[in-house]
């Protein structure tokens, strides 16, 4: 039985240079306890884009529009979108420990950059 | 209409055991998080334990930690709670209580009276 | 663990006045832009029953006269008009991810 589902709705987003990209993800439960990141790319290369405990993000904000009850916005919105930023982005739970460990990953959603 | 319905409780003696048990209908048992929360005159409300909606991950604070164990049977719709070495302070009343987030409690059951003493 | 300051402890209110609670976290319950606190009702007799889930969302079925505020560590549960079936005991209760889930001490709501 899944314990919780990790929803990305988008395949693919497409954004002008310059502006900002809203990277949608919603959760089903908050169990297992634990914290939710963000990462483009995957496998152990891949570059951590948010985490809500530690780190400095300055393009990153959150932008739940959380108001269902059996679900849980996690979306992020990444400002002055740039080339270099296309990518394919997935928001993955994780489950608390030492060190956390991963969970379940969102399916991902494919960034791509138009020109202004 | 969702029911949560304990049963189980009573008086037992310091050191002694009891198991807590809720039987849930009205809703898809086995898609929700649950939990049991006790109450008392002096401390309120207290968590004591949950459980995931697959019944692979559970969560006590230390209160309770090593000697409760909550697990489900999805099967029969059913949570329970075994309650080891109980102590006075483990007098209560104890309410299941289901979550379909794991977040907020939405719905509670009547409660379940639990009295340990000599 | 969070502690949960609520206060006050009972509150007398006339009936259609504003009956105000509030409850303040020793930390931050937030994550990703959403306050993890959470408001009850019991009365006498009865199991608590789910009012505002994560701080401002109203739960199906409760009266709109209920509202929730708040982010990070302060919140308050509001009830305006305060009615007589409104009379009874209120916890708010945060589920962050620091356990343990911890509640406030209630707040006993009176009509003066």
């Known amino acids: 039985e899944e314990e919780l589902q990790v929803i990305q709705p988008d395949k693919s987003v497409s954004v002008a240079a310059g502006e900002s990209a809203i990277l949608h993800c919603t959760v089903t439960s908050l169990i297992p306890v634990g914290p939710i990141q963000w990462f483009r790319g995957a496998g152990p290369a891949r570059e951590l884009i948010y985490n809500q405990k530690e780190g400095h993000f300055p393009r990153v904000t959150t932008v739940s529009e959380s108001t269902k009850r059996e679900n849980m916005d996690f979306s992020i919105s990444i400002s002055n979108i740039t080339p270099a930023d296309a990518g394919t982005y997935y928001c993955v739970k994780f489950r608390k420990g030492s060190p956390d460990t991963e969970f379940k990953s969102g399916a991902g959603t494919e960034l791509s950059v138009r020109a202004k | 209409e969702v029911q949560l319905v304990e049963s189980g409780g009573g008086l037992v003696k310091p050191g002694g055991s009891l198991r807590l048990s809720c039987a849930a209908s009205?809703?898809?048992?086995?898609?929700?998080?649950m939990s049991w929360v006790r109450q008392t005159p002096g401390k309120g409300l207290e968590w004591v334990a949950t459980?995931?909606?697959?019944?692979?991950?559970?969560y006590y604070p230390d209160s309770v930690k090593g000697r409760f164990t909550l697990s489900r049977d999805n099967a029969k719709n059913s949570l329970y709670l075994q309650m080891n070495s109980l102590r006075a302070e483990d007098t209560a009343v104890y309410y299941c209580a289901s979550s379909v987030d794991g977040s907020a409690f939405d719905y509670w059951g009547q409660g379940t009276t639990v009295t340990v003493s000599s | 663990d969070i502690v949960i300051t609520q206060s006050p402890a009972s509150l007398a209110v006339s009936l259609g006045e504003r009956a105000t609670i509030s409850c303040r976290a020793s930390e931050s319950v937030d994550s990703y832009g959403m306050s993890f606190m959470h408001w009850y009702q019991q009365k006498p007799g009865q199991p608590p029953k789910l009012l505002i889930y994560?701080?401002?969302n109203l739960e199906s079925g409760v009266p709109d006269r209920f509202s929730g505020s708040g982010s990070r560590t302060d919140f308050t549960l509001t009830i305006n008009p305060l009615q007589a079936e409104d009379v009874a005991t209120y916890y708010c209760?945060?589920?962050?991810?620091?356990?343990?889930?911890?509640f406030g001490g209630g707040t006993k709501v009176e009509i003066k």
């Open positions: 209760h945060q589920s962050s991810e620091n356990l343990p889930w911890t």
């Open positions: 994560r701080a401002s």
């Open positions: 009205g809703f898809t048992f086995s898609s929700y998080v």
């Open positions: 459980i995931s909606s697959g019944g692979t991950y559970t």
